[in-house]
Interface confidence: medium
Amino acid sequence: QEDEDGDYEELVLALRSEEDGLAEAPEHGTTATFHRCAKDPWRLPGTYVVVLKEETHLSQSERTARRLQAQAARRGYLTKILHVFHGLLPGFLVKMSGDLLELALKLPHVDYIEEDSSVFAQSIPWNLERITPPRYRADEYQPPDGGSLVEVYLLDTSIQSDHREIEGRVMVTDFENVPEEDGTRFHRQASKCDSHGTHLAGVVSGRDAGVAKGASMRSLRVLNCQGKGTVSGTLIGLEFIRKSQLVQPVGPLVVLLPLAGGYSRVLNAACQRLARAGVVLVTAAGNFRDDACLYSPASAPEVITVGATNAQDQPVTLGTLGTNFGRCVDLFAPGEDIIGASSDCSTCFVSQSGTSQAAAHVAGIAAMMLSAEPELTLAELRQRLIHFSAKDVINEAWFPEDQRVLTPNLVAALPPSTHGAGWQLFCRTVWSAHSGPTRMATAVARCAPDEELLSCSSFSRSGKRRGERMEAQGGKLVCRAHNAFGGEGVYAIARCCLLPQANCSVHTAPPAEASMGTRVHCHQQGHVLTGCSSHWEVEDLGTHKPPVLRPRGQPNQCVGHREASIHASCCHAPGLECKVKEHGIPAPQEQVTVACEEGWTLTGCSALPGTSHVLGAYAVDNTCVVRSRDVSTTGSTSEGAVTAVAICCRSRHLAQASQELQ
């Protein structure tokens, strides 16, 4: 029970320490916003995370919290400060009446307030049949003693640290922040409480059934015995990791978050801060057979988000639900009937399923890669995970039709050799959120901070779009796609690459008016063409009869419709060379593709001509895909002729650097 007088003493002190000008207005023109979980049953009203502006100091956070308490007390409300955040995000966690939100939003330094909500373990079911001894052969998977230089933090349930699979490999920290269990008939049973976390620790680093057998782990308890936690508890856990990292810097850190809740601005922000501090975060996509972008931390762009597939490369079905999907998923990994440590006894094994298990596989692979190359950045690691994945093996028919193009068809795999990938030019495709259907709607796709945007394309299911352009935003290039009148919305598609010492710029040619079409080329010395984009203001590009194909011997040139402005992405980087590859089909075709050869990487993907029956262009791995309207609606006129244009690049500099190392 609580000491009531203690609470009031704190309030009285707060009142005394503040001046009379308590209701100080926030900085002019700024309005703090309130956010809450879109999934009503997961809401936890009465507890709020007050997030302060980025540059707020700890002392200001404490003062703001006291100010809130003082103002609330004047109105007869009791409040309780549960935690003051610093290290990751400035702010505080407060228990208070919802009636005080309006007041709290007006406090100085407040950026936004988020109501607390639940997060859940992402494994189903927690106990199937016990398997003792384990149902696998020890000689099937015996990688080198991988991951020994890496520390993996697990934010999950409590764990059975003396299980023979993980004994001596997992350090149980003293961190615990969990809600009480629900329900009237719940009995805490140690084996149930430890079930989820023990299994995942085993999948990551277990002696027999682990991926990275050399990795050491640290566990934080943020999920209760029912596998339930809170956004606020997870935030405090992430802050704990950041503080540990600052106090005692070690080698590379991987943080495994095998949990999911509704979309949370604050949880995503905390993940972003931790990722930018050099920590690799891996999370479960979620088990809701839904768009992963609706969940957190799965929707955080800086986090590696993992969906689940089974042994037949089918997306995992879990009861009536299954793995999440969509553009927020980075890749898939095994997540059905995964054998691992069972908390029922110290030598027991059990199989569990879910995106938690899939995320644990990727955390193990990441630990192996980082142990082999400790200097890898998050962007480099993510690109390598994508590069070494098995491509195009997932049966996409399981996904809703509108999500198939957005969902990566990638299943995580260990690299054939942990060294020697340095010469490769790595690129990945990043899809934006959907723009929405309004006439002037746009969609923006962004690359990670240390990736280069080498090309930009767009896609619309209705075909009504006004193209795309690369533009500067906050000192970085972004890819922006434009919807057209009557369109159902567009996607922007960025091609994001790792290109050290690159200097890239965009050259634009306005609509040509002349009948030969618009052209633009890379005119700076040493700059090569990596991508072409086109954007038009007219609602519907007419058919463009004159040829718009590139004249031979002019590879550094983008061409397009005379009514469109054309944008060329031109880059200079040591040893970078690129070539244009085209595949034109004279007859109308719903899909035209062109791929880059072995040793070359697709950096740009666009369509010629840019007429309205072309739905758009996008890169899938090393293949440029151009989609057109249903052939039956276009007829077999010359308008149906479409050319897919790929720009393929390689870096002789990276190849040489790699050879020198070997």
Partner: nanobody, 126 residues
Framework: QVKLEESGGGLVQAGGSLRLSCAAS????????VGWFRQAPGKEREFVAA????????EYAENVKGRFVISKDNVKSTVFLQMNSLKPEDSAVYYC???????????????????WGQGTQVTVSS
């Protein structure tokens, strides 16, 4: 220091009635919710009913609706639970609890109530 004290428990025949009282002493905040919970042997504590500080707004668990009535004496800071048509399955220790951080919605979660009384035993014989 706020203290909650329950009284009024006892032994009663099935179909009978009891009136439980919860008296709050000390300084309570201006806004709060008082809830009644019960716990039978070997079972988790469960929500029974709750009332806001004004006494005007109440909430009940499905299994007691129409049989139990929660009310508040604003002068004496006492909350009552009138229990009618009692059944053997109503036998439990009844606890009074205070939620000092009320939200627009009532909460039936044990964890949202942060001050508790010692409890009073109610036994309904068949």
């Amino acid at each position: 220091q706020v203290k909650l004290e329950e009284s009024g428990g006892g032994l009663v025949q099935a179909g009978g009635s009891l009136r439980l009282s919860c008296a709050a002493s000390g300084r309570t905040p201006r806004h709060y919710i008082v809830g009644w919970f019960r716990q039978a042997p070997g079972k988790e504590r469960e929500f029974v009913a709750a009332v806001r500080e004004s006494g005007s707004s109440t909430e009940y668990a499905e299994n007691v609706k129409g049989r139990f009535v929660i009310s508040k004496d604003n002068v004496k800071s006492t909350v009552f639970l009138q229990m009618n048509s009692l059944k053997p399955e109503d036998s439990a220790v009844y606890y009074c609890a205070l939620d000092r951080f009320p939200t627009p919605e009532f909460s039936d979660r044990v964890g949202h109530y942060d001050l508790w009384g010692q409890g009073t035993q109610v036994t309904v014989s068949s």
